[in-house]
């Protein structure tokens, strides 16, 4: 039975040209995290595998840095980076948990963090 929940940084905003950390945290389960995928709806950004380490998709290699922890740092942000990002936690024995973050990249300096929220 899947008892865990994913807590994410929720809806976040950042300035064009800046950087942002995408973070998810799995709680309320003793399941072992064996892999975390970072994805957009149509493309994979990065994978952190417990045995194989980090893999960054070639199309993001210049602008994505692994970490901190199981998170992902996006750099040199453009307006085209606005959208949804998914953290997919592969766990044993529970299965797969998913969290969602919406990032808005702003032209001006009015960027600030939104509220935290949870996806069960």
């Amino acid at each position: 039975m899947m008892t865990g929940t994913i807590e994410t940084t929720g809806n976040i905003s950042a300035e064009k040209g800046g950087s942002i950390i995408l973070q998810c945290h799995l709680s309320s389960t003793t399941a072992q995290v064996t892999q975390v995928n970072w994805e957009q709806q149509d493309q994979l950004l990065a994978i952190c595998n417990a045995d194989l380490g980090w893999h960054i998709s070639p199309s993001f290699k210049d602008r994505v840095a692994p970490g901190p922890g199981l998170g992902l740092t996006l750099q040199s942000l453009t307006v085209n980076d606005t959208g949804e990002y998914f953290c997919i936690y592969h766990t044993y024995p529970d299965g797969t948990y998913t969290g969602r973050i919406f990032l808005e990249v702003l032209e001006s300096s009015v960027a600030e963090h939104g509220a935290r929220f949870q996806i069960p």
């Epitope: 994805e39 493309q43 994979l44 893999h55 592969h90």
Partner: antibody, heavy 118, light 107 residues
Framework: QVQLQESGPGLVKPSQTLSLTCTVS?????????WNWIRQPPGKGLEWMGY???????RYNPSLKSRITISRDTSKNQFSLKFSSVTAADTAVYYC???????????WGQGTLVTVSS | DIQMTQSPSSLSTSVGDRVTITCKAS??????VAWYQQKPGKAPKLLIY???YRYTGVPSRFSGSGSGTDFTFTISSVQPEDFATYYC?????????FGQGTRLEIK
């Protein structure tokens, strides 16, 4: 439990437009996920054609992009495929499918065979 | 596009045998490979995602492994209901692509 069901004409003439609809039950197509079309010519492998996301964004296979349109009717909880200028090579079983965030496909319709012939 | 090449294209085996199918990607897809089972006249069924993770309800005799460009799908002890065609799929980048299939037949 989400269920998908394809419908549309089983026979289309060459050069015409193929039109198919996928009716989804048990889940709102505007709630989440991306809703896909995948086809399989008789005796051959599978080809991903494109999707429409819960928010209405579309993404198409570049090899088909000039001929394909995926749209939706949220009031009927349906999404549709229009595929133009068909030839005999487009004869296939057409499946609708719901993609997981990680881009694997857990949910499929039963498929509908479309034959392109005059 | 990323090409997925499966081998063999067909395989004759007996109930109780161990069977292995391979899939080779034309470029590094890390662990982003899924496996499906398809029976005649039916839609594909997801068995494995992310190279080695069994989908909900899939029996433990089905397993997957591999990373990079080389992937393996194994049935540890073939059951009568396992005779079908199996496909690999890369879920690394669009357009998502499938292998040409491996048909598992009764010897």
């Amino acid at each position: 439990q989400v269920q998908l069901q394809e419908s549309g004409p089983g026979l289309v003439k060459p050069s015409q437009t193929l039109s198919l609809t996928c009716t989804v039950s048990g889940y709102s197509i505007t709630s989440d996920y991306a809703w896909n079309w995948i086809r399989q010519p008789p005796g051959k492998g599978l080809e991903w054609m494109g999707y429409i996301s819960y928010s209405g964004n579309t993404r198409y296979n570049p090899s088909l992009k000039s001929r394909i349109t995926i749209s939706r009717d949220t009031s009927k909880n349906q999404f549709s495929l229009k595929f133009s200028s068909v030839t005999a090579a487009d004869t296939a079983v057409y499946y609708c499918s719901r993609k997981y965030y990680g881009s694997w496909f857990p949910y499929w319709g039963q498929g509908t065979l479309v034959t392109v012939s005059s | 596009d990323i090409q997925m090449t499966q081998s063999p294209s067909s395989l004759s085996t007996s109930v109780g045998d161990r069977v292995t199918i391979t899939c080779k990607a034309s470029q590094d897809v890390f662990t982003a490979v899924a496996w499906y089972q398809q029976k005649p006249g039916k839609a594909p069924k997801l068995l494995i995602y992310s190279a080695s993770y069994r989908y909900t309800g899939v029996p433990s005799r089905f397993s997957g492994s591999g990373s990079g460009t080389d992937f393996t799908f194994t049935i540890s002890s073939v059951q009568p209901e396992d005779f079908a065609t199996y496909y690999c799929q890369q879920h690394y980048s669009t357009p998502w692509t499938f292998g040409q299939g491996t048909r598992l037949e009764i010897k």
